[in-house]
Interface confidence: low
Amino acid sequence: QPPPPPPDATCHQVRSFFQRLQPGLKWVPETPVPGSDLQVCLPKGPTCCSRKMEEKYQLTARLNMEQLLQSASMELKFLIIQNAAVFQEAFEIVVRHAKNYTNAMFKNNYPSLTPQAFEFVGEFFTDVSLYILGSDINVDDMVNELFDSLFPVIYTQLMNPGLPDSALDINECLRGARRDLKVFGNFPKLIMTQVSKSLQVTRIFLQALNLGIEVINTTDHLKFSKDCGRMLTRMWYCSYCQGLMMVKPCGGYCNVVMQGCMAGVVEIDKYWREYILSLEELVNGMYRIYDMENVLLGLFSTIHDSIQYVQKNAGKLTTTIGKLCAHSQQRQYR
Amino acid sequence: SAYYPEDLFIDKKVLKVAHVEHEETLSSRRRELIQKLKSFISFYSALPGYICSHSPVAENDTLCWNGQELVERYSQKAARNGMKNQFNLHELKMKGPEPVVSQIIDKLKHINQLLRTMSMPKGRVLDKNLDEEGFESGDCGDDEDECIGGSGDGMIKVKNQLRFLAELAYDLDVDDAPGNSQQATPKDNEISTFHNLGNVH
């Protein structure tokens, strides 16, 4: 064991170094002192530290630690913030495209339905966007509302064009008949299944990313305990009291101190690992009906098929609905 | 700072998303994110080591500081002495995490449970049933362009997969209203509508 270097007889080095941390020299002793009031940098002999300096060192050590923690998480934080923003935007674009495709389908195939169809399609996709962002909307209700709204227009414009299209009471009857008679066959049910599954997954994916940001932000801004501050001071700054400016902490010692300071934070590890692996599982399953891009961009096609299904069965349906909604129709012609 | 993605080109006339070499789909972007996240899977357990390696620690020096004195780097005293006669490290660990950390752990537990619930087991029966119910109807198969409409002039073609983050200016003339015309806003035409903090390859 080599002998320690002689203490700085004038504390000059310590003073010039401390000045960088705290302008104003009044806290640094002129010459080494016994340091009996020190609580962290317990002296083995004369020391160039005072109680005030010790306090400043503790504050600086905790700040250093906070900055080290922040820089450690910077890349991860950017990664998640960036992707949360990117995916949120991407999903909005998909919804916008899906709406455009559906409107285009109506415009090209059923121009007589367009004004009202555009309105119903718009409302449906607005709800889709809100749902993805966390709104408390029921997907089945959204799909039912779309078909409930579309059917009266299809009936009055395509199946039975002679009827006045402003008839509110027949509209109500038609909305009811739509469900009772399963006018669109199994298509609404099919769309409900696809849309609810894909949107649920999308929504939780975004929620998970936003929670990821919250986790990093929480650990990023942790305030370290006084005990930790003392351990860090002892490791990083107590050597200065002996005039040992250039000496660095031992590696093993640093690890022990850090594990002590980080004990609480490290407890997140198990759940963080699980979070990433669970997110991976979710992402691996995001295909076909669990992929909103796939489902929403194909929706126009399914809606088109559903209208063709209605048209195919138009004769039978018109007769049945004629009987079912006769009361409403009579009142209307009066 | 470079915050924006690449352009994605759309031929508006036929509503066909043009294929741009190497552009990403959303699913590939998701997988890429997971791969990057997995490189941070040990982030919290590795933190103590990371911070030691990013703060001054004796690596090549013969002597190092153990909290009380100058010692030889590989001596027994290098890790041990600094902790003696100080507050108890075990005690520090026993205090448990701060309330904010406990709260965030609870939130993680909750989302993990949700994520697990949502991650369906392999061979999902639903997929099969849906196919039988005619999800992929007509001649427009998986790898082809999906078809809109029946035939003739009413037909519009679209790519089944939207290339990742399609152009932000895309607005069909039937977008929003009975008026059938909507202008794309100047902001939409820009490439930089989000802080991408990096590249979209």
Epitope: - | S1, A2, E6, T193, L197
Partner: antibody
Amino acid sequence: QVQLVQSGAEVKKPGASVKVSCKASGYTFTSYGISWVRQAPGQRLEWMGWINAGNGNTKYSQKFQGRVTITRDTSASTAYMELSSLRSEDTAVYYCATVVYWGQGTL
Amino acid sequence: EIVLTQSPLSLPVTPGEPASISCRSSQSLLHSNGYNYLDWYLQKPGQSPQILIYLGSHRASGVPDRFSGSASGTDFTLKISRVEAEDVGVYYCMQALQTPLTFGGGTK
């Protein structure tokens, strides 16, 4: 840690070209785009253009279009900015920047 | 292009006092994903600009918590709760919503 180290100061005659380099270290070079920004004496900061370090795609400010070329060499983790047809008003400090990190500047 | 107008041009402050810098944008910098695409930079004498705040209100790592960013419509504010001697320099706002990226004129 992340560092962007730029090439040294240059003195050029009007009409000439200049090529400034920006060597990146401390992160995966291809993961982030690199912007070039200049600051003429007493003027505000001015964005010149950007390169996607992953695939080499570029975006230039209208003001510099045709005069500026931004390239990169992934094997050397280095980005380059070449400005041609120099004029006296191009006298400035030129910075490269990635995410939130900036180079030290090249006069 | 988006024009950013910063005020004041110069701001003399005594250490320990709060300070506030304003940046007004010629158009909204709020993206539909909820983030404001505005950053704040500090350029100390003889140095490169360094990031303080990104995405309107996110403090960059290593930046003291006396710095904060806020937004109200097209008005953005950088606040320093207690100015320290080391905070001397020129502060710039920068928008990243669309190209060309543009900067404010700076506040000294």
